[in-house]
Amino acid sequence: EAIQVTQPSVVLASSHGVASFPCEYSPSHNTDEVRVTVLRQTNDQMTEVCATTFTEKNTVGFLDYPFCSGTFNESRVNLTIQGLRAVDTGLYLCKVELMYPPPYFVGMGNGTQIYVIDPEPCPDSD
């Protein structure tokens, strides 16, 4: 059973390689357990970047992932990916699964294109 997941189409990472974007879903029923997965699409392949399960008591996620963090509030997840470099530029998709109570609902956003520009190295100063 499907839910609609929305995320911004484009985000520019900061000069420190940090990109933040929201991932929202609807409809939202009273949900005890929400699983959020960030996937990166390259060509026809999807690779998992990070995943976490949010609950009423656990609203801060991705504790097992050094490059991801996120907070959960009602039907919105604020995602942050750090440590990004130019080679990480690509399409990042947010997948949301409503795990409890049933029925199971799942939805995938259209993706956020994250652009990462490596900072210019500082010129040596004599």
Partner: antibody, heavy 117, light 107 residues
Framework: EVQLVESGGGLVQPGGSLRLSCAAS????????IHWVRQAPGKGLEWVAS????????DYADSVKGRFTISADTSKNTAYLQMNSLRAEDTAVYYC??????????WGQGTLVTVSS | DIQMTQSPSSLSASVGDRVTITCRAS??????VAWYQQKPGKAPKLLIY???SLYSGVPSRFSGSRSGTDFTLTISSLQPEDFATYYC?????????FGQGTKVEIK
Amino acid sequence: EVQLVESGGGLVQPGGSLRLSCAASGFTFSSYYIHWVRQAPGKGLEWVASISSYADYTDYADSVKGRFTISADTSKNTAYLQMNSLRAEDTAVYYCARQSYYGLDYWGQGTLVTVSS
Amino acid sequence: DIQMTQSPSSLSASVGDRVTITCRASQSVSSAVAWYQQKPGKAPKLLIYSASSLYSGVPSRFSGSRSGTDFTLTISSLQPEDFATYYCQQLSRGPSTFGQGTKVEIK
């Protein structure tokens, strides 16, 4: 039309085993939790176990933990309750039920398990 | 495990009476509580889910409410077909539990 049909009940000796089946139809089986609930003669409802195939999750009442195993075959839309080391106090009508949100909205007709020598 | 303490265990009432049954959870279960009606030899029927939502096809004289860990089933005007046994159930994540049941009998 949503339907749950239990089968597999019967008379078994103490220490014996029995496997109950719950055949589901009329809904997407894999999107729901299935529960087993029992009722001893003249007594109240007792929750036994639950399973979610999509979440790969099972849970049991303390009274049956280690003796009963709940499982599901999504290709057959069927949930099972394997009951081992049966005792006289396991004698009851066993119901399977579907959980939707915070309630069991569809129940089977029940199957009677009698544990006696 | 979370315990559900249901009261009273039985009550006698007349047609037209207002009937209240209470369940107290031993710890917080949010709104994860359901109420059922059961008649002899039959499977239970869902009346209220998510503490206060009326299940489809259930008469509006049935209602559910929550105050902290206390959950209440109210029948506003008892009808002849309402004489039965009523159970609460908590369905928060983890093992589920039922209340002991309340038998509603004719006075």
